[in-house]
């Protein structure tokens, strides 16, 4: 699997999408886990509803929420109030029994540009008001890290 980068602004929300083959993964619950180290285990953060038919219902663990469009084949994870410590490697998983298939490897980057956190009224630089969005979901443009490319793991 290539790693897909999703970038979100610190303090705002970030939406991560994981597409999959809906037929191949029919009847399977999904999960979002955080990779602990390069070779370490993937620690479960949140998983979809225990009843697969109710996978469309949003389930939450702290600031992380998950919902699954089982017909369209898209798993969506929302990270609210993104913080620097949220930066790192994650996986979208499809569960079957005690096994888990990786749907997508994800690198979450937390953007920390200080101009994103200035009140528009206090701002001293012109033409920057577009940076001061409310904490709406950031539909990040993701990019894939090519095979062999070493990703930059952000530090917090």
């Amino acid at each position: 699997h290539n790693t897909t980068v999703f970038q979100g602004v610190e303090g705002q929300s970030l939406q991560v999408s994981c597409p999959y083959d809906s037929m191949k993964h029919w009847g399977r619950r999904k999960a979002w886990c955080r990779q602990l180290g390069e070779k370490g285990p993937c620690q479960r953060v949140v998983s979809t509803h225990n009843l697969w038919l109710l996978s469309f219902l949003r389930r939450r663990n702290g600031s992380t929420a998950i919902t699954d469009d089982t017909l369209g084949g898209t798993l969506t994870i929302t990270l609210r109030n993104l913080q620097p410590h949220d930066a790192g490697f994650y996986q979208c998983q499809s569960l079957h029994g005690s096994e888990a298939d990786t749907l997508r490897k994800v690198l979450v980057e937390v953007l920390a540009d200080p101009l994103d956190h200035r009140d528009a009224g206090d701002l001293w630089v012109p033409g920057e008001s577009e940076s001061f969005e409310d904490a709406h979901v950031e539909h990040s443009i993701s990019r894939s890290l090519l095979e062999g490319e070493i990703p930059f793991p952000p530090t917090s």
Epitope: E109, A112, D113, P114, H117, D119, D122
Partner: antibody
Framework: EVQLVETGGSLVQPGKSLRLTCATS????????LHWVRQSPEKHPEWVAH??????????YYAESVKGRFTISRDDSKSSVFLQMNSLKEEDTAIYYC??????WGQGTLVTVSS | DVVLTQAPLSVSVTPGESASISCRSS???????????LYWYLQKPGMSPHLLIY???NLASGIPDRFSGSGSETDFTLKISEVEPEDVGVYYC?????????FGAGTKLELK
Amino acid sequence: EVQLVETGGSLVQPGKSLRLTCATSGFPFSNVWLHWVRQSPEKHPEWVAHIKAKSDNYATYYAESVKGRFTISRDDSKSSVFLQMNSLKEEDTAIYYCTDILEYWGQGTLVTVSS
Amino acid sequence: DVVLTQAPLSVSVTPGESASISCRSSRSLLTSKGITSLYWYLQKPGMSPHLLIYRMSNLASGIPDRFSGSGSETDFTLKISEVEPEDVGVYYCAQFLVYPYTFGAGTKLELK
């Protein structure tokens, strides 16, 4: 007029502690995120620590080199930000600047760690 | 950490001539929002750093338009079109894309 005035820098021995204070005026302190940046003699600036506003629960972040030894805090009622530095090392020797890392910078205070 | 490499380490310029300073990043500083989190500072002797350029190419308040910033995702240039005596000092690039914020090693500008 915007002012940031750092105080508290001095000569200390390795392993000792020091508390830096940055008193500010002339800008809306309470909603500005503030940082400490240090600069060793003849070296480039190095980001040290960062504290957010009350609305962000005064969240703090640190450079790896100071994590566990330095603590950043702020007092909005006094428009001041602080840097508590424990277990000081010789490599902590630098001028310490209080800044919003954009337009507001203090003149710096010199911390010298030497035996 | 993001490493910023500046070149040259020092530059000597005759007043009225132009000067260019380069800054290369170990990774892309372009965000998915189309913002490039590369900043330029001037530190005059005995002073604290002073912001010149924000987000790669935007002139900070009060900075003369002799200064300009440009670049791509990883390679950046600060240009001073007609150097004046007051421009003497050390120029630093800095990235504020991700923590920890990092600065380049600096380029010292002197007058001939």
